[in-house]
Interface confidence: low
């Protein structure tokens, strides 16, 4: 028996359902009683879901997995993973045994988009050209870790005094805080771009300082 899976990682958004595709080619006269199907975590070999002795043995993984029972006889051994979490990310092995056996691994990449950045300025009043200011760009609840870029009003990169921290919350999603310390010109726009490298999602925030008032 030959097992086939997608070579590309399956990308799933947090809180949505994902399908890990796996298929085999059943011989004529194939019966589900002949099938032993096991999904397991590739690295730890932890059992995720199984179908043996002609019946679905159910989820061994947080009760969030399911097979496609009506499609098994056609050779569809795909696994549905519900309400995807950050901790579900990784490699899953589909193991099929009929008379002989084969297995293949499929990768699950979890992602969550970042929120539109909020911008804060310190100090935020009585600003003059030449003052040193701290601009903070905050974006929330994304995954995986973001790439953060700062640019000036001409779109040129600001790479100088930048400190970026990323903290994971209890769900494994990241909150990003990036701080730019800059000496004010006569006026200027400072833009922060938070990029999710998996989703190719860019979230933009900017602050324009033109004396008073500031615009965000």
């Amino acid at each position: 028996v030959e097992v086939q899976v997608s070579e590309d990682p399956v990308v799933a958004l947090v809180d949505t359902d994902a399908t890990l595709r796996c298929s085999f080619s059943p011989e004529p006269g194939f019966s589900l009683r002949q099938l032993n199907l096991i999904w397991q975590l590739t690295d730890t070999k932890q059992l995720v879901h199984s179908f043996t002795e002609g019946r679905d043995q159910g989820s061994a993984y947080a009760n969030r997995t399911a097979l496609f029972p009506d499609l098994l006889v056609q050779g569809n051994a795909s696994l549905r993973l519900q309400r995807v979490r950050v901790t579900d990310e990784g490699s899953y092995t589909c193991f099929v045994s009929i008379q002989d056996f084969d297995s293949a691994a499929v990768s699950l990449q979890v992602a969550a988009p970042y929120s539109k950045p909020s911008m804060t300025l310190e100090p935020n009043k009585d600003l003059r050209p030449g003052d040193m200011v701290t601009i903070t760009c905050s974006s929330y609840q994304g995954y995986p870790e973001a790439e953060v870029f700062w640019k000036d009003g001409q779109g040129l990169p600001l790479t100088g005094n930048v400190t970026t921290s990323q903290m994971a919350n209890e769900r494994g999603l990241f909150d990003v805080h990036s701080v730019l310390r800059v000496v004010l010109g006569a006026n200027g726009t400072y833009s922060c771009l938070v990029r999710n490298p998996v989703l190719q999602q860019d979230a933009h925030g900017s602050v324009t300082i033109t004396g008073q008032p500031m615009t965000f």
């Epitope: 997608s6 590309d8 399956v10 990308v11 799933a12 958004l13 809180d15 949505t16 359902d17 994902a18 399908t19 519900q82 309400r83 992602a111 969550a112 988009p113 929120s115 609840q141 999710n196 998996v198 989703l199 190719q200 999602q201 860019d202």
Partner: antibody
Framework: EVQLVESGGGLVQPGGSLRLSCAAS????????IHWVRQAPGKGLEWVAW????????YYADSVKGRFTISADTSKNTAYLQMNSLRAEDTAVYYC???????????WGQGTLVTVSS | DIQMTQSPSSLSASVGDRVTITCRAS??????VAWYQQKPGKAPKLLIY???SLYSGVPSRFSGSRSGTDFTLTISSLQPEDFATYYC?????????FGQGTKVEIK
């Protein structure tokens, strides 16, 4: 059986407002992103916006940003598209669709026609 | 924004023909590209997702592939029910864009 049913379309004057609804059934609404996609008469598909039903994540096409607002009510299994400052070029059939995996929408509603005309 | 340029805009073919439709992305994109079939007065139907994965219940005569920024939908042997309009769609940077569509007509 998964179903999405749009409602709320109709004839509205330029500058007017309309709220579309997308009633979902047959799946766990709170775990799926929902999209709105539109199709002008005789034209192609144009993506409008998406939302996670928690309301935490939303995203809009540039053409509707600032005029349209997408929202969801998980207690009613319904997504909404509030359309303000409507223009003639917003005339289209509006579909809601369920997000399947990144880059795809697997179930679509039947669509509701919005006509913006004086 | 990333543009998806779809070609041809229309084609005539006969039952049993092999049909190929291409979408070219204006810049580098991930494999998050989907293909849909739409018939007049109906909602689109998902055929292919992640560039090459066949959606559940879709006949195996449909396939998708990728080469760089070019994405291709192939119908290996056109059937009467396949005469329709086909759209590609990408989702880079959370902004979704569709190709202009390809109408497949009976020769």
């Amino acid at each position: 059986e998964v179903q999405l049913v749009e409602s709320g379309g109709g004839l509205v004057q330029p500058g007017g407002s309309l709220r579309l609804s997308c009633a979902a059934s047959g799946f766990t609404f709170s775990t799926y992103y929902i999209h709105w996609v539109r199709q002008a008469p005789g034209k192609g598909l144009e993506w409008v916006a998406w939302i996670h039903p928690s309301g935490k994540y939303t995203y809009y096409a540039d053409s509707v940003k600032g005029r349209f607002t997408i929202s969801a009510d998980t207690s009613k299994n319904t997504a909404y598209l509030q359309m303000n400052s409507l223009r003639a070029e917003d005339t289209a059939v509006y579909y809601c669709a369920r997000h399947y995996q990144v880059g795809a929408m697997d179930y679509w509603g039947q669509g509701t026609l919005v006509t913006v005309s004086s | 924004d990333i543009q998806m340029t779809q070609s041809p805009s229309s084609l005539s073919a006969s039952v049993g023909d092999r049909v190929t439709i291409t979408c070219r992305a204006s810049q580098s994109v991930s494999s998050a590209v989907a293909w849909y079939q739409q018939k007049p007065g109906k909602a689109p139907k998902l055929l292919i997702y992640s560039a090459s994965s066949l959606y559940s219940g879709v006949p195996s005569r449909f396939s998708g592939s990728r080469s760089g920024t070019d994405f291709t939908l192939t119908i290996s042997s056109l059937q009467p029910e396949d005469f329709a309009t086909y759209y590609c769609q990408q989702s880079g940077r959370s902004l979704y864009t569709f190709g202009q569509g390809t109408k497949v007509e009976i020769k």
